[in-house]
């Protein structure tokens, strides 16, 4: 949020040189007026009067929704996930029709043993959440299932999930190659047909903070950008202080317009300030520059 600048006069001068009396209204901002009943309110930029005040739409604020916020809330999900659709062939169980019925005793038992087996297989993968059988069919038992992966959101979440999916592929390939029937019997918890292992599809959560920031900034999309702090994304305009992209207005106030951020320079009793960053001070009495 912006700190207020203590000045002894109420005059603000744009960095281009023209003086604007406060409260500042950005003349380049599109103005629409909302009228509800008898109450005529100058709620601009799509804002509406709720009977007491203007309710502003993002990214606007102010009494008349005439100002543009310096930062927009973007909320990445706490966690992001991936779903892998896999098929394996279990040879240590003979298929029966009851396995097609998900509420049968047979399916429940198969599901329990299969889940236990997969939990062992994927035990070293921190992103692993579990498995979900979607279909069982003949041959011995062809198991169509989803492997679910989840991780905390970080800017590198896609890499983390991509790496986890690769480890899943390696581990399922290994177990279905090693745990095979010998002399028509299985000595493991479950045995598999090596050739029956397939990865059908991988779906990864899509979240792009830059896209969310641009969407919420609407016509200011070219001037808002995402910066990270403690691995959390912030959608900011250059008028938000404390970031790499922050604009330093020195003796002035940063304000957003549809042409980007600009500095409105202050005029005090002793000085007036100019320049793109309001860093050129002129003493009123002596008329010489100092920096």
């Amino acid at each position: 949020p912006l700190a207020t600048i203590p000045v002894s006069t109420t005059s603000l001068t744009s960095s281009e040189g023209s003086t604007i009396s406060t409260p500042s209204v950005d003349i380049s901002t599109p103005v629409t007026t909302s009228i509800v009943g008898d109450q005529c309110s100058r709620c601009k930029n799509g804002g509406f009067w709720d009977g007491l005040k203007c309710q502003c739409l993002t990214p606007y604020y102010g009494e008349s929704c005439e100002e543009v916020v310096n930062s927009i809330d973007i909320a990445p999900p706490e966690t992001v996930s991936a779903q892998m659709e896999l098929t394996v062939t279990v040879t240590s169980v003979k298929f029966t029709d009851e396995l097609k019925n998900h509420s049968s005793q047979e399916f429940r038992e198969f599901n329990k043993t299969f889940t236990e087996q997969m939990n062992i297989v994927y035990s070293g993968i921190p992103e692993y959440v579990g498995v979900n059988i979607t279909n069982l069919r003949l041959g011995s038992v062809v198991v169509e299932h989803d492997v679910l992966l989840r991780t905390k959101y970080t800017p590198e979440y896609k890499t983390a999930l991509d790496n986890a999916t690769e480890v899943v592929k390696q581990k399922i390939t290994k177990v279905t190659t090693e745990q095979i029937m010998t002399n028509d019997n299985c000595s493991a918890l479950m045995c598999f047909n090596t050739t029956g292992t397939q990865v059908q599809n991988i779906t990864v959560t899509q979240y792009d903070p830059v896209e969310e920031c641009r969407q919420k900034a609407e016509e200011y999309e070219d001037y808002f950008l995402v910066e990270y702090r403690d691995q959390k994304p912030y959608c900011i305009s250059p008028c938000e202080s404390g970031f790499n992209a922050s604009k330093n207005c020195n003796h002035g106030k940063c304000q957003m317009s549809q042409n980007g951020a600009r500095c409105l320079c202050v005029t005090t009793e002793t000085h007036w300030y100019s320049g793109e960053d309001c860093n050129q001070g002129t003493q009123k009495s002596h008329h010489h520059h100092h920096h």
Epitope: S92, V93, K94, Q105, E106, N185, C186, C191
Partner: nanobody, 124 residues
Framework: DVQLQASGGGSVQAGGSLRLSCAAS????????MAWFRQAPGKEREVVAF????????YYADSVKGRLTISHDNAKNTLYLQMDSLKPEDTAMYYC?????????????????WGQGTQVTVSS
């Protein structure tokens, strides 16, 4: 849930016979797997034999082939183990196990339902 009750254990001289029984209840189908496992002191639990109740499959461990016979009475839902020509190395606690699946695994962890053990002691 499936319940298993084993009985028939005892002490016998080498070369003698015993018949173990295991009564099963709680099955929703008449097609499932049942097995006999045994565990001697200080050793891991090992499979003796298993059977599919539809008659599709029987299996015997090499050490008991020709001496022990597994069978199942569908009408009584009871598993049997006929033990002939017993040897001192057959001494162990014998457990019956079951699965609602048609299993072909000798790993005890794959069998979800277990009865309490019945002791078989064969002396020389």
């Amino acid at each position: 849930d499936v319940q298993l009750q084993a009985s028939g254990g005892g002490s016998v001289q080498a070369g003698g016979s015993l018949r173990l029984s295991c009564a099963a209840s709680g099955y929703t189908s008449n097609r499932y797997s049942m097995a006999w496992f045994r565990q001697a002191p200080g050793k891991e639990r090992e499979v003796v034999a298993f059977i599919w109740t539809d008659g599709g499959r029987t299996y015997y461990a090499d050490s008991v082939k020709g001496r022990l016979t597994i069978s199942h009475d569908n009408a009584k839902n009871t598993l049997y183990l006929q033990m002939d020509s017993l040897k001192p190395e057959d001494t162990a606690m014998y457990y019956c196990a079951a699965s609602s699946l048609l299993l072909q695994t000798i790993n005890p962890r794959a069998w979800p339902y277990w009865g309490q053990g019945t002791q078989v002691t064969v002396s020389s």
